[in-house]
């Protein structure tokens, strides 16, 4: 179950010459309202056929009175979304009709009069849970701009709203074989409860043990494609394995329809119902147009109505491919510099920068030392996005504010005793050792192994290290 939502952005004259006259006048003020009708599949049904997926009516828009002599502007719109709830699975492909109605508010006897101002129709592909898809449709000289999306109602999730989510029983993870429900990461996908063998692509269930078929599929497990070829003819009953059983010869024998077209008998011959993107007597000609709704993920289709016309899909951020069918892993291009963390939010790319760096792509190296003073004569050293102080002798700590204890590291070797001094440290060496750090042993004959003691100092005297 879920809701199809339609947001009307504007309704007004389209581009080009021949702007339409305003539908309202000073004598006849009016207001607009909209009706949407949804049908599953890519059917080219008549506008009067039932809205099998549902329909909705908007509120009335503000009252509008034309300013004499002014061209028709975009007309004031009703507030809010049009919402069409659907009870079953979202079909993925659907047909829509959006009607713009005018309610005249003059002095009509019997109350306001309604008249249809414009009707647009189309066929689209749309996954539930995806972003808003934007569209522009023209009806005569009028142009309608709108956005739409399908969203699932909890506990349903997925592109068809057929997967169910339940709150986690354990706080840490989902049960065996069950995935977290994106985007509801604190919930888990409910175990499949459909009838065993029910087609995961063409069937769905709302109750345990059930197997209900999406449009175009039949059979107890929804594995049999519905065929229109002479199944209704009196010559043969329907079969669960083929969808059709035709004992006698007929114009549809051998299926003359190419490219997956389905054949149906007519009084004189046969007729091919062609799949999306094919046309011609036997579906032998390929030609996708915007009417076929070829653009995915909210892509905007540009192209003519003629089957020979090309089309292109103008893709929203985060999608690419000729039909906007591929999600771009924009982080794989490593756009964040200086070790920044890349986050693809779908509608935008964000970089979370390391300390000391800034900018949309972490490209700016902040001056780590700017405004950072090192005390007691220390000097600031930049690097790696963090500042560091190189401290003068006798001081330490992050900002050289701490008086260093030069003896803390026990610098005097061989048991020498350390004394702190204003300009450093002094080692008083144990008998038999000498040097600034008492690092040199004194030979028994009184000669030192390495350099001789400076004049005036006996081995064993304190050596001041400068």
């Amino acid at each position: 179950a879920g809701v199809f939502e339609l947001q009307i952005h504007s309704f007004g004259p389209g581009p080009g010459p021949g702007a339409p006259r305003s539908p309202c006048s000073a004598r006849l003020p009016c207001r607009l309202f909209f009706r949407v009708c949804l049908k599953p599949g890519l059917s080219e049904e008549a506008a009067e056929s039932p809205c099998a997926l549902g329909a909705a009516l908007s509120a009335r828009g503000p009252v509008y009175t034309e300013q004499p002599g002014a061209p028709a502007p975009d007309l004031p719109l009703p507030d809010g979304l049009l919402q069409v709830p659907f009870r079953d699975a979202w079909p993925g492909t659907f047909s829509f009709i959006i009607e713009t109605w005018r309610e005249e508010l003059g002095d009509q006897i019997g109350g306001p009069a309604w008249s249809l101002l414009a009707r647009v129709a189309g066929r689209r592909r749309l996954a539930a849970g995806g972003p808003w898809a934007r569209d522009i449709q023209r009806a005569g000289a009028w142009e309608l701009r709108f956005s739409y999306r399908a969203r699932c109602e909890p506990p349903a999730v997925g592109t068809a709203c057929t997967r169910l989510c339940r709150p986690r029983s354990a706080p840490s993870r989902c049960g065996p074989g069950l995935r977290p429900c994106a985007p509801l990461e604190d919930e888990c996908e409910a175990p499949l409860v459909c009838r065993a063998g029910c087609s995961p692509e063409h069937g769905f269930c709302e109750q345990p043990g059930e197997c209900r078929c999406l449009e175009g599929w039949t059979g107890p497990l929804c594995t049999v494609p519905v065929s229109t070829s002479s199944c209704l003819s009196p010559r043969g009953p329907s079969s669960a394995t083929t969808g059709c059983l035709v004992p006698g010869p007929g114009p549809c024998d051998g299926n003359p329809c190419a490219n997956g077209g389905s054949c149906s008998e007519t009084p004189r011959s046969f007729e091919c119902t062609c799949p999306r993107g094919f046309y011609g007597l036997r579906c032998e000609v390929s030609g996708v147009t915007c009417a076929d709704g070829p653009c995915f993920n909210g892509g905007l289709c540009v192209g003519g109505a003629d089957p020979d016309s090309a089309y292109i899909c103008h893709c929203p951020p985060g999608f690419q491919g000729s039909n906007c069918e591929k999600r771009v892993d924009r982080c794989s291009l490593q756009p964040c510099r200086n070790g920044g963390l890349c986050l693809d939010l779908g509608h935008a790319l964000r970089c979370r920068c390391r300390a000391g760096f800034a900018g949309p792509r972490c490209e700016h190296d902040l001056d780590d030392c700017a405004g950072r003073a090192c005390a007691n004569g220390g000097t600031c050293v930049e690097g790696g996005g963090a500042h560091r102080c190189s401290c003068a002798l006798g001081f330490g700590g992050r900002d050289c504010r701490e008086r260093a204890d030069p003896c803390a590291a026990r610098p005097c070797a061989h048991g020498g005793r350390c004394y702190a001094h204003f300009s450093g440290l002094v080692c008083a060496c144990a008998p038999g050792y000498m040097g600034a750090r008492c690092e040199f042993p004194v030979h028994p004959d009184g000669a030192s192994a390495l350099p001789a003691a400076p004049p005036g100092l006996r081995p064993g005297d304190p050596q001041r290290y400068l």
Partner: nanobody, 115 residues
């Protein structure tokens, strides 16, 4: 209002070639989808070739293998290279640009293919 300007149209014999240019224009940027449409007398306007904002190209069935669309984002220009031209390619050719909010049209350039 910024306009798209086409050039390169003219008269050519069947089998000949022409190269249409559109721009330079500040409208022609990499985030726009671009196209060349054509309209023959008494017929509706149709997209002959298009190049999307993500770089995908598509062509009308009748021109596949003969026409090539390309863009030069540095020069803010889009091109249509037409070869093996036929009489049925005679039409006014329009340059077109669009993003999600707006669409832009040129005034059109006439291409005539006759012996």
């Amino acid at each position: 209002e910024v306009q798209l300007v086409e050039s390169g149209g003219g008269e050519v014999q069947p089998g000949g070639s022409l190269r249409l240019s559109c721009g330079p224009s500040e409208i022609i940027t990499s985030d726009k989808s671009m196209g060349w449409w054509r309209q023959a007398p008494g017929k509706q306007r149709n997209l002959v070739a298009g190049i999307s904002n993500v770089g995908s190209t598509n062509y009308a069935q009748s021109v596949k293998g003969r026409f090539t669309i390309s863009r030069d984002n540095a020069k803010n220009t889009v091109y249509l290279q037409m070869s093996s031209l036929r009489a049925e390619d005679t039409a006014v050719y329009y340059c077109y640009a669009r993003d999600f909010e707006n669409e832009y049209w040129g005034q059109g350039t006439l291409v005539t293919v006759k012996p």
